[in-house]
Structure formats: structure tokens, C-alpha cells
């Protein structure tokens, strides 16, 4: 008897199985339930991504894929040679022995054998397709990264050669360094040896000077004390010139012109015959207010009255428009001369403003103002300037055109800000503008990135605070 | 006309942040190094620290140095100063100016340090 029956075994794989008598042939076909679903990128008929893959990922790939390739290729052998090698002694048995149905049950399970192998070689096809398709990408991919390396390569070539230029430089410069570090080295030592020898010289410069400190005061006094007596002796030899003197006298009497007594600046002190430098008593113009001043004979021939001096920091120069106006501190140290007296001098005759100004580290400098005078109260002193000389800035730090005198009680500057209240001092303010010789006073070390300090834009930059600076006047014609 | 607008202050309470922010016209403000300064109740300025033109160095006071940071953007004419780890004494008006001949100063943005 025959039989033909297809069914599953327990692994869930198709078999086929053929009873012929005694005989029981059974076909194990290759599972194409284990190739993946469609919604796999891998799927053989999917169409190929163009997203290029990580270089691991496809390489391990185009593995899985040969591998399959190859087990398929192994299996189709062996059915073939297993159907050669089996197949013709089972099918001559056949051929004799069954009937005309079981050539029809061959002939389906052989057709069906063929379907599968047709599916097979199909599904191969496209691998096979996918695996060129990917292997072209690889090699375009290995192209460009060939490409790169290459290029990286020069590069890396040229900065080597550029890196070994440098070093070759370093090396020179570095000599260089050691050779200057050798003569520094030596200019140090020397320069520290002269430094010694100068505190030794200073020290005793100190102690002289100090001694020439206390002459001068008394120098002073008792050269206003002379001016004093100097006048008292004056009234007192014209009253007796004028008593002896009568209108029936024959003998002339030369009464001798009285010598002038009152003086408005210290130039007219200066042409008077009083050459030294000190404190001297100064009458207001067509006025016999008085006003102390300090009078500079020395400095560029003399005849300076000094306005406004600042050297240690012992007088506050935050102070009102009153004060400001009148004047305040003493003409022996730091002082402002007053802005009313100023402005009365400067209005009646053309003077000359002389600034002098003194860094920490022992450097001195000057401005000169050819033309210089206050307005009136009434202008809020505005300042007036023109023709500037000298070694403290080619550009004015006062501003021009002139702007109107401010304290912190009087607000006139051109400023959201409030520059007297916050800069300290009254000055002749713009937006702040580029000096501030009535700022704060600040010690040595103290003196950098002071906003508020003794400012001269132009000479030393907007954080420097002054050691010391003079503010004098002379007449344009003296 | 030139102008130098600070804002950006306020109450803030101790270990707080900050940021002042200075708005700058009038003047070619990548030519300048600016400053920020402040002024305690009752006492005179303080600088607080400084940038330069191009905004590659900058200086702090010792007071602020770790815990204010200036900068600037000179496409936005802005200075500005990141104020962190704030203190009661950093209680004050604070000021940005330009180190310009004139010394350009705005009107000043108060900040307050309190629990």
C-alpha cells in the first residue's frame, strides 16, 4: 500500500512523508517562516534604506547575510544530491510497483519541491542584491574616509613642520631670555646698591630738609610781621613829613612819595621788591577787603598767586558754594584761594593760569593757559580759557568750552549725576569731565582706581589720584 | 548725547545674585574701557572693577574678587556685572562709567543686600 502525508513536527518545521509499502521516505524543507517580517529593514524584498548605517552595524550584517547565502547553498546540494543519489532506485520501485495515483502524489510533492526551491532562489536573489548594494556603499564610504586620511595626513605633515619652526624659535627666544635675565640679574644689583646709597642721602635730605621747613615758617611770620611794621613806619614818617611841612615854610620840604601799601596780586608784590616766596595780604579790586594768599616768587620768575594747593590731604575740599566762594584753608599748606576775589582780579586785567601737578612716583608736570579768568557768581565762575602749553597733556583736562563751577550744595554740571556729591569737591565739572584737582586726597598705594581722587585726565588717566598739585596766576603782561 | 542707563538693581537677600546691566549711547563705546564703581550710604566711591575695550582683561577690587564677575557686549553697547554670594556691605548705588576723557557717569541703580 501507499500513502502520502504532510504534516508538523513538535519544532514547528513543514515535513513531508511518503509511505511506499515497507517503506517510509520523509522530506524536510527548508523554513521560510524563519526569515523575518516585512516590517524588518532586512526583509529581502524591502526596499534598501538610504540611511547609511554605522560601519560595525553593516559589516555585521553582510557576516549574518553570507552565512545565510551559504547554508542555503549547502542545503540545496545536498537535496539535489539527495535526490539524485535516493530518488532513482525509489523511483524505478515506484515506477513498478505503484499505480498511476502515487505518480500524481510524486509528481506534487516535486512540484511543490519546486515552488520551494523557485521561493528560495528568489529570496537569494535579493540578498544577493541587498549584499551589492551595501558593499557599494562600504567601498564609497572606505573611499572617502581614504580621502580624509589623506588630507589629515598632509595636515598633520605641515604642523609638524610648523611645530619644529616653532621650537627652533623657542629655543633661540629662550636663550635670548637666559642672556637678559644674566644683565637684568646685574643692573639689579647695581640698581639696589643705588638705591641704598639714595635712602641714605634721603634720610639725611630729610632731616635738613625738615630744619629749612621750620626756617621758613618763622621766615614767614616774621616777614608779615616786617610788612607790618614796614606800613606802621610808613604812616608814621608821612604824619611827620606832614607836620613839618607848613604853608608859610620858605625852605622846600621834598615830602617823598608814599610807597604803595595795598596790593591786589603778588606780581604787584613781586615789582614792589618783596622777592620771597610766603604769605602776603592781598586787598580786593576797588575794595579794601583783604584776603590772605600764598605768593610763589620762585617758580618761572616770580610773582605768582597761588589759588588753590593740595599736598597732604589735611584740609577736606568737600565743601559748600559759600566756602568755595570766600575761600578756605591756609595759605602755608593746602588752601583755596576763594572764587569771588578770583573772579574780581581775572575780570580787570588778562592773567595767566600756571597748574602744577606732582605724580607718586616722583614725576612732575605743568600746564600753562595763556588766557584765564572766572565769570561772576551771577555765571555760576564759569572757567575761561585759551593757549595751552606744557608737559601735563596736549589736550585740556579742564573741559573746553568752559563749564560752571559746582560743589555739593550747588549742582551746575552737565550731568544726570550729581559729579561734586559724587566725585568730592567743587570744581568746574562737565559730565564728570576729564580733571578734579578738589577730589578726594588718597595716600601712596592708595592712589590707583580712584574715581573721586586729584584727577588730571591727560597726564595720568581717569583712576589716578595726584600727590600734589598748585593752581597760580600771574598777569599776561608781567 | 551721551548716556550710561544702569538698572538691573534691587533687594536681594544675603548669598543672592545679581545682574546690573548698563546700556551705553552717545559715544563709540568698543573704543572705551568702562568701570563699574559704588557708593555706600554716606561714603565715597569705591571701585569695584574694570574691563577693557575688547573685553579680554578685566581687574576686581579685592572686596567683590570671586564673587563678581563684569563683561560686555559691545554689539549691544551693554557692560554688564554678574554679582553672586551677595553681602549686606555690598549695599550701595552702583555706577557704570567709561574711562573716557570726560569720565561719562549715569545716574546709578541702587542695590539693596538684607534679610
Known amino acids: 500500500y501507499s500513502n502520502f502525508r504532510k504534516s508538523v513536527d513538535s519544532t514547528g518545521r513543514r515535513q513531508y512523508q511518503v509511505q511506499n509499502g515497507p517503506c517510509s521516505y520523509t522530506f524536510l524543507l527548508p523554513e521560510t517562516d524563519s526569515c523575518r517580517s516585512s516590517s524588518s529593514p532586512y526583509m529581502s524584498n524591502a526596499v534598501q534604506r538610504d540611511a547609511p548605517l554605522d560601519y560595525d552595524d553593516s559589516v555585521q550584517r553582510l557576516q549574518v547575510l553570507e552565512n545565510i547565502l551559504e547554508n542555503n547553498t549547502q542545503w540545496l546540494m545536498k537535496l539535489e544530491n539527495y535526490i539524485q543519489d535516493n530518488m532513482k532506485k525509489e523511483m524505478v520501485e515506484i515506477q513498478q510497483n505503484v499505480v498511476q495515483n502515487q505518480t500524481a502524489v510524486m509528481i506534487e510533492i516535486g512540484t511543490s519541491l519546486l515552488n520551494q526551491t523557485a521561493a528560495q532562489t528568489r529570496k537569494l536573489t535579493d540578498v544577493e542584491a541587498q549584499v551589492l548594494n551595501q558593499t557599494t556603499r562600504l567601498e564609497l564610504q572606505l573611499l572617502q574616509h581614504s580621502i580624509s586620511t589623506n588630507k589629515l595626513e598632509k595636515q598633520i605633515l605641515d604642523q609638524t613642520s610648523e611645530i619644529n619652526k616653532l621650537q627652533n624659535k623657542n629655543s633661540f627666544l629662550e636663550q635670548k631670555v637666559l642672556d637678559m635675565e644674566g644683565k637684568h640679574s646685574e643692573q639689579l644689583q647695581s640698581m639696589k646698591e643705588q638705591k641704598d646709597e639714595l635712602q641714605v642721602l634721603v634720610s639725611k635730605q630729610s632731616s635738613v630738609i625738615d630744619e629749612l621747613e621750620k626756617k621758613l615758617v618763622t621766615a614767614t611770620v616774621n616777614n608779615s610781621l616786617l610788612q607790618k611794621q614796614q606800613h606802621d613806619l610808613m604812616e608814621t614818617v608821612n604824619s611827620l613829613l606832614t607836620m613839618m611841612s607848613s604853608p608859610n615854610s620858605k625852605s622846600s620840604v621834598a615830602i617823598r612819595k608814599e610807597e604803595q601799601t595795598t596790593f591786589r596780586d603778588c606780581a604787584e608784590i613781586f615789582k614792589s621788591g618783596l622777592t620771597t616766596s610766603g604769605i602776603y595780604t592781598l586787598t580786593f579790586p576797588n575794595s579794601t577787603e583783604e584776603i590772605k594768599a600764598y605768593c610763589d616768587m620762585d617758580v618761572g620768575g616770580g610773582g605768582w598767586t597761588v589759588i588753590q594747593h593740595r599736598e597732604d590731604g589735611s584740609v577736606d575740599f568737600q565743601r559748600t558754594w559759600k566756602e568755595y566762594k570766600e575761600g578756605f584753608g591756609s595759605p602755608l599748606g593746602e588752601y583755596w584761594l576763594g572764587n569771588e576775589f578770583v573772579s574780581q582780579l581775572t575780570g580787570q586785567h588778562r592773567y595767566v593760569l600756571k597748574i602744577q601737578l606732582k605724580d607718586w612716583e616722583g614725576n612732575e608736570a605743568h600746564s600753562l593757559y595763556d588766557h584765564f579768568y572766572l565769570a561772576g557768581e551771577e555765571s555760576n565762575y564759569r572757567i575761561h580759557l585759551t593757549g595751552l602749553t606744557g608737559t601735563a597733556g596736549k589736550i585740556s583736562s579742564i573741559s573746553q568750552p568752559g563749564s560752571d563751577f559746582s560743589t555739593k550744595d550747588s549742582d551746575n554740571d552737565k550731568c544726570i549725576c550729581k559729579c561734586s556729591q559724587m566725585l568730592s569737591g567743587g570744581w568746574w565739572f562737565d559730565a564728570c569731565g576729564p580733571s578734579n584737582l578738589n577730589g578726594q586726597y588718597y595716600p601712596q598705594k592708595q592712589n590707583t582706581n580712584k574715581f573721586n581722587g586729584i584727577k588730571w585726565y591727560y597726564w595720568k588717566g581717569s583712576g589716578y589720584s595726584l600727590k600734589a598739585t598748585t593752581m597760580m596766576i600771574r598777569p599776561a603782561d608781567f | 548725547e551721551v548716556q550710561l542707563v544702569e538698572s538691573g538693581g534691587g533687594l536681594v537677600q544675603p548669598g543672592g545674585s545679581l545682574r546690573l546691566s548698563c546700556a551705553a549711547s552717545?559715544?563709540?563705546?568698543?573704543?572705551?574701557?568702562m568701570s563699574w564703581v559704588r557708593q555706600a550710604p554716606g561714603k565715597g566711591l569705591e571701585w569695584v572693577s574694570t574691563?577693557?575695550?575688547?573685553?579680554?582683561?578685566?581687574g576686581y577690587a579685592d572686596s567683590v574678587k570671586g564673587r563678581f564677575t563684569i563683561s560686555r557686549d559691545n554689539s549691544k553697547n551693554t557692560l554688564y556685572l554678574q554679582m553672586n554670594s551677595l553681602r549686606p556691605e555690598d549695599t550701595a548705588v552702583y555706577y557704570c562709567?567709561?574711562?573716557?576723557?570726560?569720565?561719562?557717569w549715569g545716574q546709578g541703580t541702587t542695590v539693596t543686600v538684607s534679610s
Open positions: 574691563i577693557n575695550s575688547g573685553g579680554g582683561r578685566t
Open positions: 562709567n567709561a574711562d573716557h576723557p570726560q569720565g561719562y
Open positions: 552717545g559715544f563709540t563705546f568698543s573704543s572705551y574701557a
